[in-house]
Interface confidence: low
């Protein structure tokens, strides 16, 4: 049966329990979750994970008695772990796995649970001992019973059957929201010193939440929601509101890359590239998060939350829930995938969405527009050719429009004034009889990649200026530093004079403004993205690619980027794999990204690593990869021993033999060497990379990847006839780096 | 905007194969399942299957495993489908139709214009 | 396979009057706490055209005259007021299990 995060069965109990036999099978990746409860006003069972280990509270009467899993075994590995608690004449057993864990006299006191057993959570129950107990499972149990009773019969609704494929679902899967009252609930979202959330969305919902947090201070919140097809986020702090929206339609069934950024001096929301974000001179503040984190709908309290709110978000939109996906999700940069979530509702693995590169076809609607922001305008000629009446004043024959259009050229993340030449007017005004400051401009489309900034009072707001504005030079232009080598700006021009005048110019005609975008040359710069600190096992060689470092350059491809390694090139520590021994002391990003590069530790303290990257004209400054060895730690997981017949062959797998060791995101290479003479057979290992009818050939020594690969066993070669079954003790000893350890 | 377009009318002999092809743009062919329906004349429809294009992989009506085969050119963006051993029960106008890329609903919401098989000796 | 069967056959409605389609399926074809049930409208030699997705949501573009309802096994396209414009083929299909099946159409005439 499938738990969420907050569901429950609830199994009645007629007469006090005098002996217990309970036997559980659960999965969870979640190191919190309520597995069990037998509840009566002070009698109690409780059995629950806590930091991923098997905690047991018995209280009998005025006895309490606590039992639990040893902290080095973790149980909130995903993967099933049996848990079966016997309570008989006086002594309570606990053993996990088969193996016994603990085990202590308890009073010979029957268990008095009038209010029933609870599966997987407590439901609303609010006994005084529940208090600080673990959240809902959000996970499988496989198999529950006591006394030989199935507790997993009836299911509610909410518990589904079978093991949910989201539990299991790596962060690579995509969150899919099946609505209509999806909700995944994640650990809160902090945004003390700045806060990032980033997806890809697929959906047509128009309208939608997609994320929320709520604040500390009550009505404190973060709201990203889709509202009529667009992105929009509200911040509320107790100072204020601060409401944007993205003119980016996104509910048109395609993936697009949404990232919203926050931090104490503004807010950010971009999608597919086109950003949209407040002034520098925000309202936000630091918002203490409380609660989780919740994406692609609302609980009750979120809901509430909105619709007390002065937006007026109504009842209807924030009952609804996302129809659509969410991928390649992150939180202020680490990934997150339906593993992660604390709970979830009507929530399926996967949207059918390829990890595949972005291809051009993705973006084609948008290339026809080149210049245009992202919606696009209505195909005009612009202005529209004005036709003035006649008995005109003769400046005004042949006259079609007012001024004549030079593109403004900006640097990229530069400013460039708005100057005569610009909005050049086509006529002499003072024979029109026209003042500067009658001519008047308004805004009625911003630029994708910058803003015009007006220093008039109170024209910002307004968005307006005047003729007079532009050759005193009070308007500029200031670019956001993005790549785009075009823009535009939308300008309604008319004229507010009294006199006689083409009616066009007192309606307003319609100009673009074109800008174009000298680019600049952005350094690269190199990010960590899971922090400047690596561990590597001592004696060992570790893998460094993209996971480890990479390089950010906003107008470079990955191909125009070459890494060196700053330091003294002898002992250098970086190697290419196919070149053992040599040390790399320049590499290139496609041989980064393609994993050719390794770190091989030799001894003694690990060497940091100084880096740099250039694009061929700018270096990014040198970035350090702080290093740590680390002595190898080998544990035995397995050793189970074989069983087979006489003569016969049997494979030695992971379930028999397989070791665990201490290194971090490393795949070490784990030797185990034979260290005493077989008595009644040997030890094989087969050629050709295991080939379908390779060879066997006896081996002294073979690598836990051959485990892994079925290409080790034990073959019997005791032709002897015995009376008994014989036992061959095979000695082994594990060697990881330099460490060994002996006597397997 | 999304446009599927289809190949032309095709006239073939009992016993022989046809190709037809569902040009698509407008939109990322490669994340999105593209369906094929079968329309006899004066009849409903029928759901032949499916193909997602970035992997090749693909979905049949049972009753039409054996008879068509859907694959799809990612480099041209074009899906195509092939119906072998002809016979006059598969004279039809076969559609190509996207399906949407969401979790749900795998409806289908742009159509080819339709190719029209006609099997004749 | 799930099985959809449309009543009626064929239906002639004055302009301006309600139009009501059934469709009824062989099991249900709900999931998710959603109905995967749509309803598609074919006007001669064109393809078929979306109307409503889930049972009840209507497709961008699509008059507010037309409205889907129904969960489980039944389910009902309403037009209202029909227009001249509305004279086609009706199918329902689901998609809660492959294979994909359609109803087998209602042929709608106009008054």
């Known amino acids: 049966a499938s738990f969420f995060g907050e569901n429950h069965l609830e199994v009645p109990v007629a007469t006090a329990l005098t002996d217990i036999d309970l036997q559980l099978q659960f999965s969870t990746s979640q190191p919190e979750a309520l597995l069990l409860l037998a509840a009566g006003p002070a009698d109690h069972l409780l059995l629950q994970l806590y930091s991923g280990r098997l905690q047991v509270r018995l209280v009998l009467g005025q006895e309490e008695l606590r039992l639990q899993t040893p902290a080095e075994t973790l149980l909130s590995d995903s993967i099933p772990h049996t848990v079966v608690l016997t309570v008989v004449e006086g002594w309570a057993t606990l053993s996990v796995d088969g193996f016994l864990n603990a085990s202590s006299a308890v009073p010979g006191a029957p268990l008095e649970v009038p209010y029933g057993l609870f599966v997987g959570g407590t439901g609303t129950l609010g006994l005084p001992y529940l208090r600080g107990t673990s959240r809902p499972l959000r996970g499988c149990l496989h198999a529950a019973t006591l006394n030989g009773r199935s507790l997993l019969r009836p299911l509610t609704p909410d518990v589904h059957e079978g093991c949910a494929e989201e539990f299991s679902a790596s962060d690579d899967v995509a969150l899919g929201f099946s609505g209509p009252h999806s909700l995944a609930a994640f650990p809160a979202w902090g945004t003390q010193d700045e806060g990032t959330l980033e997806f890809t969305l697929t959906t047509q919902s128009r309208q939608a939440p997609l994320a929320f947090q709520a604040g500390g201070r009550r009505g404190d919140f973060i709201y990203v929601d889709i509202f009529e097809g667009h992105l929009r986020a509200v911040v509320e702090k107790g100072q204020g509101t601060v409401l944007l929206h993205n003119s980016v339609p996104v509910a048109d069934g395609q993936p697009h890359e949404v990232s919203v950024h926050i931090n104490a001096h503004r807010l950010e929301i971009s999608v597919d590239q086109y950003p949209t974000h407040t002034s520098n001179r925000g309202v936000l503040s630091y918002l203490e998060p409380r609660g989780s984190l919740l994406l692609g709908g609302l609980d009750a309290e979120a809901s509430r939350h909105l619709q007390e709110h002065r937006l007026g978000l109504t009842p209807e939109a924030t009952n609804a829930s996302l129809l659509g996906c969410m991928e390649d999700l992150s939180v202020n940069g680490q990934r997150r995938g339906l593993r992660e979530a604390l709970l979830t509702r009507n929530m399926a693995a996967g949207c059918r969405l390829e990890e595949e590169e972005y291809e051009d076809d993705a973006y084609g609607h948008y290339e026809a527009f080149s210049t245009l922001a992202p919606e696009a305008w209505p195909a005009m000629e612009l202005p529209e050719p004005c036709v003035p009446e006649p008995g005109l004043p003769p400046v005004f024959a042949n006259f079609t429009q007012l001024l004549t259009i030079s593109p403004l050229v900006v640097a990229e993340g530069g400013t460039a004034w708005l100057e005569w030449r610009h909005v050049q007017p086509t006529l002499d005004l003072m024979e029109a009889e026209l003042r500067k400051s009658q001519v008047l401009f308004s805004v009625t489309r911003g630029a994708r990649h910058g803003e015009l900034e007006l220093d008039i009072p109170g024209a910002q707001a307004r968005k307006m200026f005047t003729l007079l504005d532009v050759v005193n030079r009070k308007a500029r232009f200031i670019h956001d530093g993005s790549e785009d080598t075009s823009d535009q700006l939308v300008l309604e021009v008319s004229v507010t004079a009294r006199v006689p005048m083409p009616s066009c110019l007192r309606r307003g005609q319609t100009y673009l403004l074109p800008i174009q975008v000298n680019p600049v040359n952005d350094p690269p710069h190199i990010i960590f993205p899971h922090g400047s600190l690596m561990v590597i096992l001592e004696h060992t060689q570790k893998p460094l690619g993209p996971e480890v470092f990479q390089a950010y350059d906003p107008d470079s491809a990955c191909e125009g980027l070459t890494f060196q390694v700053l330091g003294t090139s002898s002992g250098l520590p970086v190697e290419r794999r196919d070149q053992p021994g040599e040390p790399a002391t320049e590499f290139s990003c496609r041989e980064l990204e393609a994993g050719s590069l390794v770190y091989v530790h030799r001894g003694g303290p690990a060497q940091d690593l100084t880096f740099r990257v250039s694009d061929g004209l700018q270096a990014s400054p040198p970035a350090t990869l702080k290093v740590v060895a680390i002595r190898p730690a080998i544990q035995i997981h397995r050793s189970t021993g074989l069983r087979l017949a006489q003569g016969s062959a049997m494979p030695i797998l992971p379930a028999n033999l397989s070791v665990e060791t201490n290194a971090v995101g490393q795949d070490v290479s784990v030797l185990f060497r034979v260290t005493g003479a077989l008595q009644f057979g040997e030890l094989q290992k087969q050629g050709a990379g295991g080939v379908e009818g390779a060879e066997w050939w006896a081996t002294q020594a073979f690598h836990q990847r051959d485990v892994e690969q079925g290409r080790v066993r034990y073959l019997s070669t005791d032709p002897q006839h015995h009376a008994y079954d014989t036992v061959e003790n095979l000695a082994l000893e594990v060697q990881v780096g330099q460490e060994i350890l002996s006597n397997l | 905007q999304v446009q599927l377009q289809q190949s032309g009318p095709e006239l073939v002999k009992p016993g022989a194969s046809v190709k037809i092809s569902c040009k698509a743009s407008?939109?990322?062919?490669?994340?999105?399942?593209m369906n094929w329906v079968k329309q006899r004349p004066g009849q409903g429809l029928e759901w032949i299957g499916r193909?997602?294009?970035?992997?090749?992989?693909?979905n049949y009506n049972g009753k039409f495993k054996g008879k068509a085969t859907l694959t799809a050119d990612k480099s041209s963006s074009t899906a195509y489908m092939q119906v072998s051993s002809l016979t006059s029960v598969d004279s039809a106008v076969y559609f190509c139709?996207?399906?949407?890329?969401?979790?749900?609903?795998?409806?289908?919401?742009?159509w080819g214009q339709g190719t029209s098989v006609t099997v004749s000796s | 396979n799930i099985v959809l069967t449309q009543s009626p056959a064929s239906l002639a409605v004055s302009l301006g009057q309600r139009a009501t389609i059934s469709c009824r399926a062989s099991?249900?074809?709900?999931?998710?706490?959603?109905?995967?049930m749509h309803w598609y409208q074919q006007k001669p030699g064109q393809p078929p055209k979306l109307l409503i997705y889930?049972?009840?949501n209507l497709e961008s573009g699509v008059p507010a005259r037309f409205s889907g309802s129904g969960s489980r096994t039944d389910f009902t396209l309403t037009i209202d007021p029909v227009e001249a414009d509305d004279a086609a083929t009706y199918y329902c299909?689901?998609?809660?299990?492959?294979?994909?099946?359609f109803g087998s159409g209602t042929k709608l005439e106009i008054k």
């Open positions: 139709a996207r399906g949407n890329t969401v979790v749900v609903p795998y409806t289908m919401d742009y």
């Open positions: 407008g939109y990322a062919f490669s994340r999105s399942w």
């Open positions: 099991e249900s074809v709900d999931s998710y706490g959603n109905s995967f």
């Open positions: 299909q689901q998609n809660n299990e492959d294979p994909l099946t």
């Open positions: 889930l049972a009840s």
């Open positions: 193909i997602y294009p970035g992997d090749g992989d693909t």
